[in-house]
């Protein structure tokens, strides 16, 4: 019989469901085991206006070493604030710098992505190495990309519609799922049902869906049933803050006893059938009814407590309410640019508006130096000789002072420019790990120790070693020592920095062929990166050092020739 229960959208204050899924509108995963570079491509579509995105890259150590280098190609259609986490991963990031703003310096190698259409972006990425994964995502709030996880049976990655990215990629859409509710006619009492229906995915491997249920009721006030229906290969791990009746397909277990599996039931796989099931279980209210793509984590927040169900009369706003202005985030958006003996601070209005901030003033430490309103941005510019600039041997410093409507006291942030004319970068070669006696000679088979320093030292900036190679001329070729801030090969080790923070590494050189070159050039690219602030202040320099090579040794490790 037809169950009379008119499902209507429920307001977000009554119930909200967020979820994490590996289903994508278009995607592919492939295995490229012998590739030098692991290439991942993300096409991200956002609604108009700036969005915030959390992007996490995770890698497991394989054979005790970090994975190969990774190229992540990020193609976005509108402005994005990106919070990137990629600790310890030798990452190269290709993105459009006019659309992507980092919430903090990314600390990875970056490349400007040409403004190509999708096809050419894929071709551009594939020129650099076999694509391990590619995906199109619509309005993601967060993305987790697991490296070295590709389980694809294909040896190449060809975008296809409605793909399951497996363990390689999981993401959380910004828009919560549509939650609907209704009254089951003719049923007395206050028992409520929460129905979650997970739709079949593209791949049919066994899956566990974690369901977190948070009901804001006093424990005694609740009489509820949780109905979980999904494809046969789905089992459920339930994490609920209330006791309730559980009715599921497949098997389920509880977070507190994860190893104890309980067999579920055969449930109907239509909305009508599931409403009938709720009625059969004596529920008078369907407090939430949600249909989702195959998900890995689902969170249900509801505050119905068997009380009166409130459905929203009109289509509801599906984005969660925005927070009030965050001064910390606002200050992190100030971009510092240093050129032509002047410091320029830029604050884009679009970003400010997105944070719901109202700015009443932007000045340097000297309040008479005020920002200009240039339509789409505030621009504050001053020569190094005015506006209270503090000039030291290595740096020009000031303070950005922002007055915002929601705060009685102004927000302050230190801003710096490097005095590049006064900075000098040196490469030092040492024959012992104590870094005491400098040398310009390396001996094959003997470890050499290298330190890079900048003087005078710059405490607000971090000196990092991006890449190093040894050029041994026409016979010896080039030996890559460091690439993407990671050691290349097992004869190179990154060492702890000096007490002053100078980067250090060691390497061991061997030759298998003769003649052995008598000289070589050690070439390192270093970066000074602000410890806080925007990545547009990064400074890169390449430092060279001529080396002599003595005494042959025809056994060993890094071979060239």
């Amino acid at each position: 019989e037809t169950v009379h229960c008119d499902l209507q959208p429920v307001g977000p204050e009554r119930g909200e469901v967020t979820y994490t899924t590996s289903q994508v509108s278009k995607g592919c995963v492939a295995q490229a085991p012998n590739a030098i570079l692991e290439v991942h491509v993300l096409f991200l579509e956002f609604p108009t206006g700036p969005s915030q995105l959390e992007l996490t890259l995770q890698a497991s150590k394989q054979n005790g070493t970090w994975p190969r280098e990774v190229l992540l190609v990020l193609s976005v259609n509108s402005s994005v604030f990106l919070h990137l986490q990629a600790l310890g991963i030798p990452l190269h990031l290709a993105y459009n710098s006019s659309l992507v703003t980092f919430q903090e310096p990314p600390g990875v190698n970056t490349t400007e992505l040409p403004s190509f259409p999708k096809t050419q972006i894929l071709e551009w990425a594939a020129e650099r190495g076999p694509i391990t994964s590619a995906a199109e995502l619509n309005d993601p709030q967060s993305i987790l990309l697991r490296l070295g996880q590709a389980q694809g049976s294909l040896s190449f990655c060809m975008l296809e519609a409605s793909q399951d990215m497996g363990r390689t990629l999981e993401w959380r859409p910004r828009t919560p799922a549509l939650v609907r509710g209704c009254h089951l006619e003719g049923v007395a009492g206050h028992k409520e049902a929460h129905i979650l229906r997970v739709l079949p995915g593209h791949s049919a491997g066994p899956r566990t869906v974690t369901v977190k249920v948070e009901l804001s009721c006093a424990p005694g006030d609740l009489d509820a049933v949780l109905i979980l229906q999904g494809p046969p290969y789905v089992s459920w791990l339930i994490d609920a803050n209330h006791n309730m009746q559980i009715w599921t397909t497949g098997e389920y277990s509880f977070k507190i006893f994860p190893e104890k599996n309980i067999r579920g039931f055969k449930l109907p796989d239509t909305p009508q059938g599931l409403l009938g099931e709720a009625r059969m279980l004596n529920a008078s209210i369907v407090a939430s009814f949600v249909e989702l793509p195959l998900a890995s984590i689902v969170s249900l927040h509801a505050s119905s407590c068997g009380g009166r169900l409130q459905t929203s009369p009109a289509p509801i706003q599906t984005t969660p309410p925005k927070d009030t202005c965050s001064p910390e985030l606002l200050m992190s958006l100030i971009q510092t640019k240093c050129a032509d003996d002047a410091m320029t601070l830029v604050l884009k209005k679009e970003l400010v508006a997105h944070l719901k901030c109202t700015i009443t003033g932007l000045t340097f430490w000297d309040p008479s130096c005020e920002a200009e309103d240039r339509g789409d941005k505030f621009v504050l510019r001053s020569a190094y000789s005015s506006c209270g600039m503090q000039v030291s041997a290595s740096m020009i410093s000031n303070e950005a002072v922002v007055n915002i409507l929601s705060s009685s006291s102004p927000q302050r942030k230190k801003v710096h420019c490097l005095n590049m004319d006064s900075l000098s970068f040196q490469l030092g070669l040492y024959l012992s790990p104590h870094f005491l006696q400098a040398s310009n000679t390396i001996e094959p088979g003997q470890q050499s120790f290298v330190q890079v320093r900048v003087s005078p030292s710059v405490s607000e900036f971090l000196l990092q070693l991006d890449s190093c190679h040894l050029d041994l001329g026409p016979e010896g070729g080039t030996v890559e020592l460091i690439q993407g801030r990671a050691a290349k090969g097992n004869c190179v080790s990154l060492l702890s920095p000096s007490p002053e923070g100078d980067p250090r590494f060691s390497f061991l050189l061997h030759f298998y062929t003769v003649p052995i070159p008598k000289t070589g050039t050690l070439s390192c690219t270093v970066a000074l990166r602000p410890k806080t602030g925007s990545q547009d202040q990064e400074v890169h320099r390449t430092v060279f050092m001529r080396l002599n090579i003595i005494s042959p040794d025809l056994s060993g490790c890094t071979s060239k020739g």
Epitope: A30, N34, A35, I36, L37, F116, P117, K118, T119, Q120, L122, E123, W124, A125, A126, E127, R128, G129, P130, I131, F156, C157, M158, L159, T478
Partner: antibody
Framework: EVQLEQSGPEVVKPGTSVKISCKTS????????LHWIKQNQGKSLEWIGG????????TYRQKFKDKATLTVDKSSSTAFMELRSLTSDDSAVYFC?????????????WGQGTTLTVSS | ENVLTQSPAIMSASLGEKVTMTCRAS?????VYWYQQKSDASPKLWIY???NLAPGVPARFSGSGSGNSYSLTISSMEGEDAATYYC?????????FGGGTKLEIK
């Protein structure tokens, strides 16, 4: 089945122009760029440039920038290459080829070639 | 531009013989691609990403190399392998091809 069908041989006079075509079928044209390659008699291959069916965007090898113009007609899934100010150096076989990102962006399907003879 | 030099320009091999041809790049490249062309026919993609065989290519073919030096090897020459083989690179612009190695049957 993927097919790239090129127009027939051309014999033209020096100083004139010629437009050769490459009709594609068997695949979604917007998912691949289409490229043109020149092969001189008994010589190697020389990449001329490529075009995106999606937006008509082109990339050229510098030396062909003033020589070749690449265009597409989406409605007929056809790509064109116009060669102007022809000289005997332009006499060659011209191939169109599809690029496939999943094969490392290599040219995975080629047309049968169009022979161009420039002679007075 | 990155010049790809193939050697030898012409070679002949007996049926069943092992064949190796090389491709040297004037600047280091990450991968090379190989195409096979028979007379009066279009080139065919033969090997991509240095060592991956294109669909339909016999397993007797293999590719290897890195940096500036790459090679294509046929473990046991067969009659149908007689053709000209071109190497190509994509990483530096403009995309360039080698001059070709013509493989004939002895």
């Amino acid at each position: 089945e993927v097919q790239l069908e090129q127009s027939g041989p051309e014999v033209v006079k020096p100083g004139t122009s010629v437009k050769i075509s490459c009709k594609t079928s068997g695949y979604t044209i917007t998912e691949h760029t289409l490229h043109w390659i020149k092969q001189n008699q008994g010589k190697s291959l020389e990449w001329i440039g490529g075009i995106n069916f999606d937006n008509g965007g082109t990339t050229y090898r510098q030396k062909f920038k003033d020589k070749a113009t690449l265009t597409v007609d989406k409605s007929s899934s056809t790509a064109f290459m116009e060669l102007r100010s022809l000289t005997s150096d332009d006499s060659a076989v011209y191939f169109c080829a599809r690029r496939a990102y999943y094969y490392g962006s290599a040219f995975d399907y080629w047309g049968q070639g169009t022979t161009l003879t420039v002679s007075s | 531009e990155n010049v790809l030099t193939q050697s030898p320009a012409i070679m002949s091999a007996s049926l069943g013989e092992k064949v190796t041809m090389t491709c040297r790049a004037s600047s280091s490249v990450n991968y090379v691609y190989w195409y096979q062309q028979k007379s009066d026919a279009s080139p065919k993609l033969w090997i991509y990403y240095t060592s991956n065989l294109a669909p339909g290519v016999p397993a007797r073919f293999s590719g290897s190399g890195s940096g500036n030096s790459y090679s294509l090897t046929i473990s046991s020459m067969e009659g149908e392998d007689a053709a000209t083989y071109y190497c190509q690179q994509f990483i530096s612009f403009p995309y360039t091809f080698g001059g070709g190695t013509k493989l004939e049957i002895k």
